[in-house]
Interface confidence: medium
């Protein structure tokens, strides 16, 4: 059997025998275009493609539509993988989405969606989610049904206001909704009573800004 040299996601990399977490090169589906991503090969059986990470406030997440489309940051630290790649990938087969959260008191929680995909750019990378389980709230902190993606220069929310400008960061804002993992990073002891922080309402409430977040995807049949 010929050895696989290009990979669409971290699950394919894991199955090829590369089982060490780190930065790998992924290839867009049906294309030769490449993108660098961090692969978590340990958590929950491995094979996770990290599509978002916040951990220290080192990267500015108040970015343009184009930046959220192509991705920004550093895969070894804080970054956004890119809406276009994630949209193309999640429309090829069924993916699960796991969102791992840390607060400032040493607690951790997660939300797992059994089916996740993003619509195309023409449909504003609208998020589609089904089947929530996990410890970060029994109700989805990403509004259902899913909303279009909004950025500071691409206002697609359901608010008279501009959620992305008011709350900062690109996200699937409603009006403005119970979450924003791309909000302002507040250091410890500045992380409460902040309306524009890193929010996951059904775990920590509206004014609490989280210490760390990771969004990761993996094929449902992994």
């Amino acid at each position: 059997k010929e050895e696989q040299t290009t990979f669409r996601d971290c699950a394919e990399i894991f199955k090829s025998g590369l089982t060490t977490s780190g930065i790998y090169t992924l290839t867009f589906p049906n294309s030769t275009e490449e993108i660098k991503a961090y692969c978590d090969m340990e958590a929950g059986g491995g094979g996770w493609t990290i599509i978002q990470r916040r951990e220290d406030g080192s990267v500015d997440f108040q970015r343009t539509w184009k930046e959220y489309k192509v991705g920004f940051g550093n895969p070894s630290g804080e970054y956004w993988l890119g809406n276009e790649f994630v949209s193309q990938l999640t429309n090829q087969q069924r993916y699960v989405l796991k969102i791992h959260l840390k607060d400032w008191e040493g607690n951790e929680a997660y939300s797992l969606y059994e089916h996740f995909y993003l619509s195309s750019e023409e449909l504003n990378y609208r998020i589609h989610l089904k089947g929530l389980t996990g410890t970060a709230g029994k109700i989805s902190s990403i509004s259902q049904p899913g909303n279009d993606f909004s950025t500071k220069d691409g206002d697609n929310d359901k608010c008279i206001c501009k959620c992305s400008q008011m709350l900062t960061g690109g996200w699937w804002f409603d009006a403005c909704g119970p979450s924003n993992l791309n909000g302002m990073y507040y250091p410890q002891r500045q992380n409460t009573n902040k309306f524009n922080g890193i929010k996951w309402y059904y775990w920590k409430g509206s004014g609490y800004s989280l210490k760390a977040t990771t969004m990761m995807i993996r094929p449902a049949d992994f």
């Epitope: 507040y186 002891r189 500045q190 009573n193």
Partner: antibody, heavy 120, light 106 residues
Framework: EVQMVESGGGLVQPGGSLRLSCAAS????????MSWVRQAPGKGLEWVAN????????YHVDSVKGRFTISRDNAENSLFLQMSSLRAEDTAVYYC?????????????WGQGTLVTVSS | EIVMTQSPATLSVSPGERAILSCRAS??????LAWYQQKPGQAPRLLIY???TRATGIPARFSGSGSGTEFTLTISSLQSEDFAVYYC????????FGQGTKVEIK
Amino acid sequence: EVQMVESGGGLVQPGGSLRLSCAASGFTLRSYWMSWVRQAPGKGLEWVANIKEDGSEKYHVDSVKGRFTISRDNAENSLFLQMSSLRAEDTAVYYCARDMEASAGLFDYWGQGTLVTVSS
Amino acid sequence: EIVMTQSPATLSVSPGERAILSCRASQSISSNLAWYQQKPGQAPRLLIYGASTRATGIPARFSGSGSGTEFTLTISSLQSEDFAVYYCQQYNYWWTFGQGTKVEIK
């Protein structure tokens, strides 16, 4: 009486390194966040770095990230700032400051400062 | 970064008179503002925090007000020991200082 005494400043060439120390007394260091704040000659104040009570959280201003590292030794009641790849713009009086309880970055006691001069 | 702008840069006041110093934040910082006094060759001294709360041992002639983006430090009757440089500082999102206001004898 709360007291903080900085040391370790001096003249250093661009690209060089220095380690600043702050000896604290009159309070229990392990109960407080601590910070370094600097002041360039004739200029205003700039927060540089701070560190949680047990050393598990550290923050640095963007202009010094990757070059400066804050640390502490609670057993010795000491705070440190390791500075490397020094630049002319790092020339300043460096103060160690105690963060007021329950509010990071609000400085209720300061040392008298130590002067760092970066020049060839 | 939140930018703090103080005005005026220099304030000339006679002893016994009132001094009013202003500080503006580039975005809302709620009441997370402090004022410090610094005399030549000395370290800064905390005067006011929470925009209006006097620190321990600070005389009642010092008062602070404001919230959001506009703040004021008032010294009701200037004493000789009050002539110094005053800095405002926000601690709402990271930590930044204003450029200072020098209060000098008129």
